[in-house]
């Protein structure tokens, strides 16, 4: 009997009520692997979620978030409100980044400006709530008579903020 069920392909289930015949998954359900005894109910993308891919008999629906929200987690398990650049999402909503921090995305947290002096460099362009500082040559490199053989270091590429 087990062998009969293992013959049932994805998109069907092994129907015990019908002598283990392979029956198609009912509407709004799916089975992504063969040999299933039941079909899973399709996920519905409603409210803040919108449908990216419709459910089929062999695969679950895939959701996205509506405009103004972004996906978090695997397969968009959650939607989180977007904020403006220069802000972060707190329990009380979107709040401006504190002085000395920035966020160049619509999501994630405000991060501290790069401390140029740690790399022996000087601040070339001041930071803002939306942008990190740009570090330039060290103060010694800018003094008269200093060698200019080495070009200034490029601005640091900010990493992605954590989800």
């Amino acid at each position: 009997l087990q062998d009969l069920c293992s013959n049932c392909p994805a998109g069907t289930f092994c129907d015990n009520n019908r002598s283990q015949i392979c029956s198609p998954c009912p509407p709004n359900s799916f089975s992504s692997a063969g040999g299933q005894r039941t079909c899973d109910i399709c996920r519905q993308c409603k409210g803040v979620f919108k449908t990216r891919k419709e459910c089929s008999s062999t695969s679950n629906a895939e959701c996205d978030c509506i405009s103004g929200y972004h996906c978090l987690g695997a397969e968009c398990s959650m939607c989180e409100q977007d904020c403006k650049q220069g802000q972060e999402l707190t329990k009380k909503g979107c709040k401006d980044c504190c002085f000395g921090t920035f966020n160049d995305q619509k999501r994630g947290i405000c991060r501290p400006w790069t401390n140029c002096s740690l790399d022996g460099k000087s601040v070339l362009v001041n930071g803002t709530k939306e942008r990190d500082v740009v570090c330039g040559p060290s103060p010694a490199d800018l003094s008269p008579g200093a060698s200019s053989a080495t070009p200034p270091a490029p601005a640091r590429e900010p990493g992605h903020s954590p989800q």
Epitope: S77, M78, G93
Partner: antibody, heavy 120, light 107 residues
Framework: QVQLVQSGAEVKKPGSSVKVSCKAS????????ISWVRQAPGQGLEWMGG????????NYAQKFQGRVTITADKSTSTAYMELSSLRSEDTAVYYC?????????????WGQGTTVTVSS | DIQMTQSPSTLSASVGDRVTITCRAS??????LAWYQQKPGKAPKLLIY???SLESGVPSRFSGSGSGTEFTLTISSLQPDDFATYYC?????????FGQGTKVEIK
């Protein structure tokens, strides 16, 4: 301070429906998400579904699709959970809970719970 | 759905003990995990989110760690108020799911 206050205990017959309310105060009701989580006697917690009131349409765990309806009334800052075709296994404490960041997400504020007993 | 398995299911300890509870996910959930404390007849209370971030107002004796499939909640020095049931919750995959709970009781 955010508060979620739920309606009182209910005793229902198998096959009937129950509607539980959850009134929110102390926060911006429309933009936060309200979920419903149930806990059968001596059991763990189970997410049923939830709603962000400004969007008006709920999302449900697949297990409860077709049997649960979650709504929200922005004018009274109240969320509702209606469960139909009740059976004895639906005997549980039903909680409403708020998530403030991602939805459904983590729950930082909870109602006090509503006990629903399904018995013939 | 992702299964969350907590161990032990019951833990007997004394005030001042260091207590560790483990939560295992049936597949990787990155760091999308929370811990809740629940006392009899009360609603759960959020302690830890994102696996290791302490919720505002929660005592620093509570800490969380782990990522992927294995997570721990540690109470560095158990207090009388900490005797309760603790649940883990994953939000990485839809629908979110909870562990079955770990009851911390007085030895």
């Amino acid at each position: 301070q955010v508060q979620l206050v739920q309606s009182g205990a209910e005793v229902k017959k198998p096959g009937s429906s129950v509607k539980v309310s959850c009134k929110a105060s102390g926060g911006t009701f429309s933009s936060y998400a309200i979920s419903w989580v149930r806990q059968a006697p001596g059991q763990g917690l189970e997410w049923m579904g939830g709603i962000i009131p400004i969007f008006g349409t709920a999302n449900y765990a697949q297990k409860f699709q077709g049997r649960v309806t979650i709504t929200a009334d922005k004018s009274t800052s109240t969320a509702y959970m209606e469960l139909s075709s009740l059976r004895s296994e639906d005997t549980a404490v039903y909680y409403c809970a708020r998530s403030s960041g991602a939805y459904p997400g983590y729950f930082d504020y909870w109602g006090q719970g509503t006990t629903v007993t399904v018995s013939s | 759905d992702i299964q969350m398995t907590q161990s032990p299911s019951t833990l007997s300890a004394s005030v001042g003990d260091r207590v560790t509870i483990t939560c295992r996910a049936s597949q990787s959930i990155s760091s999308w995990l929370a811990w809740y404390q629940q006392k009899p007849g009360k609603a759960p209370k959020l302690l830890i989110y994102d696996a290791s971030s302490l919720e505002s107002g929660v005592p620093s004796r509570f800490s969380g760690s782990g990522s992927g499939t294995e997570f721990t909640l540690t109470i560095s020095s158990l207090q009388p108020d900490d005797f309760a049931t603790y649940y883990c919750q994953q939000v990485n995959s839809y629908p979110q799911t909870f562990g079955q709970g770990t009851k911390v009781e007085i030895k």
